[in-house]
Interface confidence: medium
Amino acid sequence: PGPPPGPPRVSPDPRAELDSTVLLTRSLLADTRQLAAQLRDKFPADGDHNLDSLPTLAMSAGALGALQLPGVLTRLRADLLSYLRHVQWLRRAGGSSLKTLEPELGTLQARLDRLLRRLQLLMSRLALPQPPPDPPAPPLAPPSSAWGGIRAAHAILGGLHLTLDWAVRGLLLLKTRL
């Protein structure tokens, strides 16, 4: 009478789940660091580079004490979605100079996408409230020049590196609180 019941569902160990997310984040941090170094070697940065469309920094030493898992994962996911969009834009509109960063930029995009899916899975496995679907973001204007694309690349990779760096620290801290 119907198929036999499947094996009992084992609820995942949240620390192990978080561990694998930390590993992915660390791996992406290393990739981003290497790509940012490659960019600096090919196109040395003169001073700091900003892009208004990038997310503002979400973490610092002072914020660590009040960190909570739902807030961190939701914010991290939102910020990484923004960076994914910026990396896609960079590959599409960044100009011929940035083609020299391929295939690494494509690999970075794929790994960023993988981390985002991992965060989504982690949130559902931990039964955290799912954030509402993201409203469509306004399209990013193409860089005004080849140099504009390079400056944008410095800003995007620098911001992503900093975001991932804090993400690793925050996730490690949260793991100890589970």
Epitope: D48, S60, W166, R169
Partner: antibody, heavy 117, light 110 residues
Framework: EVQLLESGGGLVQPGGSLRLSCAAS????????MNWVRQAPGKGLEWVGV????????FYADFVKGRFTISRDNSKNTLYLQMNSLRAEDTAVYYC??????????WGQGTLVTVSS | QSVLTQPPSASGTPGQRVTISCSGS????????VNWYQQLPGTAPKLLIY???LLPSGVPDRFSGSKSGTSASLAISGLRSEDEADYYC???????????FGGGTKLTVL
């Protein structure tokens, strides 16, 4: 290129005060937490304290609490360390260091503070 | 007395592999990332390893880090004379609410 340049060190008497500065360039200063770390002559590294990127939070080592104050001026890309009630054991090279997460990825060259009568 | 414990000295001959240990507790190494710094004579410290085993740009892959429980170690393979320096481990300490360092290990290349 990221650069951190400390200044303001010198000779001061016990009980005196001194203000160190750290001028930052080559990166978006307002995005990074900043630290002070010191090293007494012939000794190891000792963390002094950290200030968050927007200046809203500060943490200090126990040995400086109430005597030292870290501040920053993001419009001037400058980090400060105000040192009061100085003691002989505060004699050290003081370094400023940038923190992107849990580590210090760039350090200044250091400025020597000598506390002696 | 440093919160993290390192051997005061270590030595090796060119080409050899040396390791430097760093032991702590659950409030620092056990729960937080370990970082390693190299300080060449007369210079400021330089980041060598972060998040236990990641290498910053420009650091040769002869350097590697590892962590297990409340201990960490730095390994240097293919030792060179320019590796002669002081090496420090570091981690955030949850109890002290601050960064702690090891006492430093002076590496001599014989």
């Amino acid at each position: 290129e990221v650069q951190l340049l400390e200044s303001g060190g010198g000779l001061v008497q016990p009980g005196g005060s001194l203000r160190l500065s750290c001028a930052a360039s080559g990166f978006t200063f307002s995005h990074y937490d900043m630290n002070w770390v010191r090293q007494a002559p012939g000794k190891g590294l000792e963390w002094v304290g950290v200030i968050s990127y927007d200046g809203s939070n500060k943490f200090y080592a126990d040995f400086v609490k109430g005597r030292f104050t870290i501040s920053r001026d993001n419009s001037k890309n400058t980090l400060y360390l105000q040192m009061n009630s100085l003691r002989a054991e505060d004699t050290a090279v003081y370094y400023c260091a940038r923190t992107p997460g849990s580590h210090f990825d760039y350090w200044g060259q250091g400025t020597l503070v000598t506390v002696s009568s | 007395q440093s919160v993290l414990t390192q051997p005061p000295s270590a030595s090796g001959t060119p080409g050899q592999r040396v390791t430097i240990s760093c032991s702590g507790s659950s409030s620092n190494i056990g729960n937080n990332a370990v970082n390693w710094y190299q300080q060449l004579p007369g210079t400021a410290p330089k980041l060598l390893i972060y998040y236990d085993d990641l290498l910053p740009s420009g650091v040769p892959d002869r350097f590697s880090g590892s962590k297990s429980g409340t201990s960490a170690s730095l390994a240097i393979s293919g030792l060179r004379s320019e590796d002669e320096a002081d090496y420090y481990c570091s981690a955030w300490d949850d109890s002290l609410n601050g960064v702690v360092f090891g006492g430093g290990t002076k590496l001599t290349v014989l």
